[in-house]
């Protein structure tokens, strides 16, 4: 006798006005008598609609929350499933059901913003700046929301950038616990004469840093051959574990480049009768605190102040 | 009485691969989902991968996804996990567990002695 | 992914003590929790599943409540056999199944 068990009831995905971030939730399926005293499992698959992939979550609850991209759809597929040991041995599972979200497709998509950027700078403050869509009326202008969790709700930009008096970007700082979770972004946009498409956006804060440059470089030349240089971590709130740094090294005409993540190198002259040495550093957040990261500026250049000739010490 | 005994641990280079083994008695092996947790030294517990009982469904942490596979052979009554490109932060000790009840994970009600990767060049 | 989130980090004790360790999740998990003790060089060993559940075998001063995001393990009367590290563990909801980072008991 084949042992059958049905899939959950109403499936759906809800939009709680996130942003992006999701509810995917069902019922439970109708149990025979037999299977009452089994625990139900439910394996969720899930994905945008252009993803080759699906993330795919075997959970006992009966919601399950997660971050998309809302500038596409969405579609979710799940069923039920019985372990072994409630079965004799065989697994069971339901047939799917499906359920999918589609976006909004108000406004044509040349109203939507362009080339949309963000720099979490110096892990301090977040800006985004973006250009109006290619096609939109003058009078059109843009609002800037954003959510992680931890906030209640949606929160509107309090400090526009702006150009001609039109909104191009936002500032962004006080930002609590906000890293190392999705950060959802949507611009919207208001004009008379047309309806306007709305932009998503989503990323982590630590993976778009961009710190302040190193300062208080220093460099001496030891035993007329060694040369040492070091610098400071920028000031903020950047432990200097997570910096990892570049350093251009210039000697006479050649110029050559090193990495390390630590704030001071050592190496030795090319030329014991160079007469010009200088270096200058930028850093980065390191593979230990983020995926990604953009490079600081680069620092002020300093050169070594000795004497090369034979006599030096 | 039910046992798990794990071979195949051992000393690799980064970069290289190990294929980990659990022998499992006193159970009806393919009733069961599997599990391997690691922990490394001095540190706490990490789930690294599961498998459901007779279809057997895959899962795994990101940490080793893509790098590490899990299968069983129910008749064998043995569970593998094979480890490629190892890093040195895949040093532990591996643990191979049997789920007490559940589809592809649950509580653990018994565990291999366990036994020691050292990923180091 | 679910945190679990233990407390304290390291519990000082003597024998006889009733013992409390907290867990909590990052998100309701309703009962699906379970509590491990270990030993130096050992394995772990379930001591509690389905937050409440006491496995078979193991001592009735252990128990285990809560439901949703807070859970307690509790050792009503310690015995020198207890001082050892206790983890919780939750099953809810995978990949990945997540561990509280350890509740070391230690002899005051």
């Known amino acids: 006798l084949e042992i059958k068990v049905n899939p959950p009831q109403d499936f759906e995905i809800l939009d709680p006005g996130l942003l992006g971030y999701l509810y995917l939730q069902w019922k439970p399926p109708v149990v025979i008598e037999k299977f009452k005293g089994c625990t139900l499992e439910y394996e969720l698959k899930y994905r945008n609609v252009d993803s080759d992939s699906w993330k795919t979550i075997i959970t006992r609850n009966l919601i399950y929350k997660d971050g998309f991209d809302l500038n596409k759809g969405i579609e979710g597929k799940i069923r039920t499933h019985l372990s072994e040991h409630c079965t004799n041995g065989s697994e069971v599972q339901s047939p799917w059901i499906e359920a999918s979200y589609g976006i909004s497709d108000e406004g044509s998509l040349e109203t939507k913003i362009q080339d949309m950027k963000c720099i979490y700078y110096n892990w301090q403050y977040l800006v985004c700046s973006w250009k109006p869509g290619k096609t939109v009326y003058s009078d059109t202008n843009y609002t800037m929301f954003f959510w992680y969790e931890g906030l209640d709700h949606a929160l509107q930009c309090a400090d526009y950038l702006q150009h001609d008096e039109k909104n191009v970007g936002c500032k962004l700082s006080n930002l609590d616990s906000s890293d190392y979770k999705d950060f959802f972004i949507c611009v919207n946009g208001s004009s008379k004469l047309e309806p306007i498409r709305s932009s998503y956006t989503v990323f982590q804060l630590q993976n778009i840093v961009k710190p302040l440059p190193p300062e208080f470089l220093h460099i001496s030349v030891e035993n007329s051959i060694d040369i040492r240089m070091k610098w400071s971590t920028p000031g903020g709130p950047i432990p200097p574990r997570c910096y990892t740094y570049e350093i251009v090294i210039r000697e006479d005409d050649i110029s050559w480049e090193s990495a390390t993540d630590k704030n001071d190198m050592k190496l030795k002259r090319r030329a014991n009768e160079s007469e010009d040495l200088c270096f200058f550093v930028r850093c980065k957040v390191n593979i230990y605190c983020a995926d990604d990261g953009i490079w600081s500026e680069w620092s002020e250049e300093e050169c070594w102040e000795g004497y090369t000739g034979p006599d030096s010490k | 009485e039910v046992q798990l005994l794990e071979s195949g641990g051992g000393l690799v280079q980064p970069g290289g691969s190990l294929r980990l083994s659990c022998a499992a008695s006193g159970f009806t092996f393919r009733k069961y989902a599997m599990g391997w947790v690691r922990q490394a030294p001095g540190k706490g517990l990490e789930w690294v991968s599961g498998?459901?009982?007779?279809?057997?469904?895959?899962y795994y942490a990101d940490s080793v996804k893509g790098r590490f596979t899990i299968s069983r052979d129910n008749s064998k009554n043995t569970l593998y996990l094979q480890m490629n490109s190892l890093r040195a932060e895949d040093t532990a000790v591996y643990y191979c567990?049997?789920?007490?009840?559940?589809w592809g994970a649950g509580a653990f009600d018994y565990w291999g002695q366990g036994t020691l990767v050292t990923v180091s060049s | 992914d679910i945190q679990m989130t233990q407390s304290p980090s390291t519990l000082s004790a003597s024998v006889g003590d009733r013992v409390t360790i907290t867990c909590r999740a990052s998100?309701?998990?309703?009962?699906?929790l379970a509590w491990y003790q270990q030993k130096p060089g050992k394995a772990p060993k379930l001591l509690i599943y389905?937050?409440?559940s006491l496995e078979s075998g193991v001592p009735s001063r252990f128990s285990g409540s809560g439901s949703g995001t807070e859970f307690t393990l509790t050792i009503s009367s310690l015995q020198p056999d207890d001082f050892a590290t206790y983890y919780c563990?939750?099953?809810?909801?995978?990949?990945?199944?997540?561990f509280g980072q350890g509740t070391k008991v230690e002899i005051k």
């Open positions: 389905d937050a409440s």
């Open positions: 998100q309701s998990i309703s009962s699906w």
């Open positions: 498998i459901s009982g007779s279809v057997g469904s895959t």
């Open positions: 563990q939750q099953y809810d909801t995978y990949p990945p199944i997540t």
């Open positions: 567990a049997k789920v007490r009840y559940g």
